[in-house]
């Protein structure tokens, strides 16, 4: 009985043509949606003039269908038992699942102004930037449509820079018609306990963004894990969105459409400061913003974003230190809504339901030479938006799963 089931499972979770795993792996059978909530700034003038707390009001959800494209350039390597691929990016707006349209306007931080002032610290260069900011009538904040903010717009200030720079700015620009990877993952043929574990990403085993173990590409991409998952396991996975590997721990048993699954969650410890979690020392890359590595709950990924001061956190600064959220009014973190979880069917290791939640923030600092940042008295990690990417196994697939996997075991 059990041995036969194990043998069947081992055979069917291998990533090669003809297996159940492979079919669902190449093109996910699950509908995946990415919901966005934008933080609309209510008091831009007061912030710019008096360095007041930033008052934000979240607006959303604005929903896009994502991950509907099949993996590309899927290539098996029989020698090292790996399969390589590109994960193409695509997003389709879903008006019926959204509170408004892509043309809705938001008052948000001026991404180009914040980024340029951070990248170019030289005071003379900042004076040049100041001239261009003034000339383009740009300010610390800007009004942008959802479409512009997410997918890109031509920035008027950057358009005046007299040497070659990318003048298109957007939080996810470029996205459509791009791909993530190349990923090279173990196909499990020789060792099923390695199936779906990433061997290399973009041709490397390390990211080059972090020091020491923080730079490692660990585990899978979280879409699946090697089979026979135990509750005691710490599940490692790599997320290119946050430019790092992270981990999830068992939280509870959940029944998903009649299928027993394990709910694994990202623990607060993963976001802790090195003071509380020494393993995180290498995610602290500078001493000033992090208050000598005592701040927690925000991750500086600027090295992964061409120097732009992007900080990733959980929505509403969940699990973040009070100093991070103190300058921002209007945030209400709660675990249920804002944490990330994976519901994993333990026998196959497949993720049958997930909610990936993260927040994109941008650092803006006072600048003596940039007029629109001159009156700031403190640094702000400004929330721009948060997202909830979810997928749940469809009813038909769940029936199939129950009959072919869990039903056979029970």
């Amino acid at each position: 009985g059990d041995l036969l089931i194990q043998k069947t499972i081992k055979k069917q979770v291998v990533l090669e043509e003809g297996t159940i795993a492979f079919k669902n792996w190449v093109k996910t059978g699950t509908e995946v949606y990415r919901q966005f909530w934008i933080f609309d700034v209510q008091n831009p003038q007061e912030v710019m003039m008096n360095s007041s707390n930033i008052q934000v009001k979240q607006r959303g959800p604005y929903t896009y269908r994502v991950r509907f494209l099949a993996k590309e350039n899927v290539t098996q390597d029989a020698e090292d038992n790996t399969v390589s691929f590109l994960q193409p990016n695509g997003a389709i707006f879903e008006p019926s699942l959204s509170v408004g349209t892509e043309a809705d306007n938001f008052t948000v931080l001026n991404l180009a102004v914040a980024a340029a002032s951070h990248i170019y610290q030289n005071q003379f260069v900042q004076m040049i930037l100041n001239s261009l900011i003034n000339k383009s009538k740009s300010s610390m904040f800007q009004v942008r449509t959802l479409r512009e903010l997410l997918w890109g717009y031509r920035d008027p200030f950057l358009s005046l820079v007299p040497y070659p720079v990318t003048t298109t700015v957007g939080l996810f620009y470029p996205y459509n018609n791009t791909a993530d990877g190349v990923y090279k993952v173990f196909n499990g043929k020789d060792n099923i306990s390695k199936v779906a574990i990433i061997d290399t990403y973009k041709g490397k085993r390390n990211l080059s963004y972090w020091e020491s173990h923080c730079d490692m590409i660990n585990g899978t991409d979280a879409a699946s894990f090697p089979p026979f998952v135990e509750k005691s396991q710490v599940l490692q996975f790599f997320s290119s969105d946050i430019c790092r590997s992270i981990y999830a721990v068992f939280e509870s048993d959940v029944n998903l459409k009649g299928i027993p699954v394990y709910r694994f969650v990202l623990p607060s410890k993963a976001f802790a400061s090195p003071v509380e979690n020494p393993d995180n020392y290498c995610f602290c890359t500078e001493k000033i913003i992090s208050k000598n590595c005592t701040s927690y709950g925000v991750l500086d990924i600027s090295k992964c974003k061409e120097g732009r001061p992007v900080y990733i956190s959980l929505p509403h600064f969940l699990y973040a230190s009070p100093d991070v959220s103190e300058p921002i009014d209007g945030l209400n973190p709660n675990e249920e809504e804002h944490r990330t979880y994976l519901d994993i069917e333990p026998i196959t290791g497949f993720t049958l339901q997930f909610a990936k939640r993260l927040q994109v923030n941008l650092l803006v600092k006072p600048s003596e030479k940039i007029q629109v940042l001159k009156n700031l008295k403190r640094n702000y990690i400004v929330p721009i938006l948060w997202l909830n990417e979810t997928g749940t196994i469809g009813d038909e697939k769940a029936n199939m799963f129950r009959s072919q996997v869990t039903g056979k075991i029970n």
């Epitope: 030289n122 100041n130 040497y163």
Partner: antibody
Framework: EVQLVQSGAEVKKPGSSVKVSCKAS????????MQWVRQAPGQGLEWMGG????????AYAQKFQGRVTLTADKSTSTAYMELSSLRSEDTAVYYC????????WGQGTLVTVSS | ETTVTQSPAFMSATTGDKVTISCITS??????MNWYQQKPGEPPKLLIS???TLRPGVPSRFSSSGYGTDFTFTINNIESEDAAYYYC?????????FGQGTKLEIK
């Protein structure tokens, strides 16, 4: 010790161009911008423009826009100021000077424009 | 453009005297004012930089004050070697602009 050494005096005809060099030593050239200032005989100081060798960022005073070109060669730690369409009122001592606060100055290059 | 109005254009003093030079700017420049001394045939020399900061090696008889639009440069206990032209420069915004200069003569 920081030193800025400029090229020698020049006599130029009206309508021609002049290129003044400024060789820096004693510090990492790309760490600081180079500014250019001129001083006509018996007159005050006038800022012409500046260049940041690291980023290539350049700013010119409106008065010189289109006539002055600033360049910097990181490999030789040398900054250059070229002024074209010279007229008699461009007769002056031209200085290169480091940073926003002009903390170190070259010895000056006298450019005489005369027919 | 920030214009800088420097006064007086000329002043005469005796050794041991105290003199002050004023620079007024057309816009608020915080404390981004610099002061220079220039002797005949020499390039200017930075005495005081932004934030009223006396440069290393500059005698303490030189000082400055001011913030916003009104700035004052002071020489206490004047010595004969202080005979020179003095210039102020605003480094808050582009274009960088100088005052017209003050000629200090020692009697």
């Amino acid at each position: 010790e920081v030193q800025l050494v400029q090229s020698g005096a020049e006599v130029k005809k009206p309508g021609s161009s002049v290129k003044v060099s400024c060789k820096a030593s004693g510090y990492r050239f790309s760490d600081y911008e180079m500014q250019w200032v001129r001083q006509a005989p018996g007159q005050g100081l006038e800022w012409m423009g500046g260049i940041d060798p690291e980023t290539g960022g350049i700013a010119y005073a409106q008065k010189f826009q289109g006539r002055v070109t600033l360049t910097a060669d990181k490999s030789t730690s040398t900054a250059y100021m070229e002024l074209s369409s010279l007229r008699s009122e461009d007769t002056a001592v031209y200085y290169c000077t480091r940073k926003l606060d002009f903390d170190y100055w070259g010895q000056g290059t006298l450019v005489t424009v005369s027919s | 453009e920030t214009t800088v109005t420097q006064s007086p254009a000329f002043m005469s003093a005796t050794t041991g005297d105290k003199v002050t030079i004023s620079c007024i700017t057309s816009t608020d420049i915080d404390d981004d004012m610099n002061w220079y001394q220039q002797k005949p045939g020499e390039p200017p020399k930075l005495l005081i930089s932004e934030g009223n900061t006396l440069r290393p090696g500059v005698p303490s008889r030189f000082s400055s004050s001011g913030y916003g639009t009104d700035f004052t440069f002071t020489i206490n206990n004047i010595e004969s070697e202080d005979a020179a032209y003095y210039y102020c420069l605003q480094s808050d915004n582009l274009p960088l602009t100088f005052g017209q200069g003050t000629k200090l003569e020692i009697k």
